[in-house]
């Protein structure tokens, strides 16, 4: 089938990084500067993405692959292939239409992006708060009361095998 196809369509022989030039009797021509073709048999080359403004180049365009962008410091990528850059906030904040705002009491954000989330309600799992939450950090819930009783087993998961010569303590 491939052989038949190549006899019928000379363009199928053009490798990535070239295009099938109709103006030149369908011979394979290299992609012009600032363009690429990532697959063979292409009749045109695609224009390279340009990383401008708040975008910066993470990977240069080549004849066979598009440029890849990320965001300048203080911004982070959003969308497939970093199609947008969004402003960073500090931990303990979230981005609103009016800019970065501190998390309300009872909520936290431990990243420079995303929204403030409510502290975990430990009591829903029958646990109590071991470490209080802050704007930057969720609460830490202690173990369940059953884990603390005198009869509680020391081991939840099975213990890993020790190296020879090491006796358990």
């Amino acid at each position: 089938f491939e052989r038949t196809r190549s006899l019928q369509d000379p363009c199928s022989n053009c490798p990535a990084g070239t295009f099938c030039d109709n103006n030149r009797n369908q011979i394979c021509s290299p992609c012009p500067p600032n363009s690429f073709s990532s697959a063979g048999g292409q009749r045109t080359c695609d224009i390279c993405r340009q990383c401008k403004g708040v975008f910066r180049t993470r990977k240069e365009c080549s004849s066979t692959s598009n440029a890849e962008c990320d965001c300048t410091p203080g911004f982070h990528c959003l969308g497939a292939g970093c199609s947008m850059c969004e402003q960073d906030c500090k931990q303990g904040q979230e981005l609103t239409k009016k800019g970065c705002k501190d998390c309300c009491f009872g909520t936290f954000n431990d990243q420079k992006r995303g929204i403030c989330r409510p502290w975990t309600n430990c009591s829903l799992d029958g646990k109590s708060v071991l470490v209080n939450g802050t704007k930057e950090r969720d609460v830490v819930c202690g173990p369940s009361p059953a884990d603390l009783s005198p009869g509680a087993s020391s081991v939840t998961p099975p213990a890993p095998a020790r190296e020879p010569g090491h006796s358990p303590q």
């Epitope: 470490v131 969720d138 939840t156």
Partner: nanobody
């Protein structure tokens, strides 16, 4: 399920020091907290110390100023430095990986005995 293995326990005289270490099979910063608990025979398990992913620490009242919890994220270990040990510190010390949702993972524990 993370697996935790404690080491460093032993017999020590009152006023002495020990350093316990807890080696975790998984990334310790993925838990809400890594903690040490202790349990004396016939008693309830008692909170000793905890360290959160951002490095915040908290201590049980009976060990404040004497014990220090620390961690090494690259080695996935959590250590407990115990100074000015007292006979009442005698217990099995157990490392715990705390999850806000889900069960706590426990190590096997290491025995600490402080003689007077």
């Amino acid at each position: 399920e993370v697996q935790l293995v404690e080491s460093g326990g032993g017999l020590v005289q009152a006023g002495g020091s020990l350093r316990l270490s807890c080696a975790a099979s998984g990334a310790i910063f993925s838990y809400n907290g890594m903690a040490w608990y202790r349990q004396a025979p016939g008693k309830q398990r008692e909170f000793v110390a905890v360290i959160t992913p951002d490095g915040t620490t908290k201590y049980g009242d009976s060990v404040k100023g004497r014990f220090t919890i620390s961690r090494d994220i690259t080695k996935n270990t959590v250590d407990l430095e115990m100074n000015s040990l007292k006979p009442e510190d005698t217990a099995v010390y157990t490392c715990a990986a705390l999850r806000n949702s889900g069960s706590t993972s426990w190590g096997q524990g290491t025995q600490v005995t402080v003689s007077s």
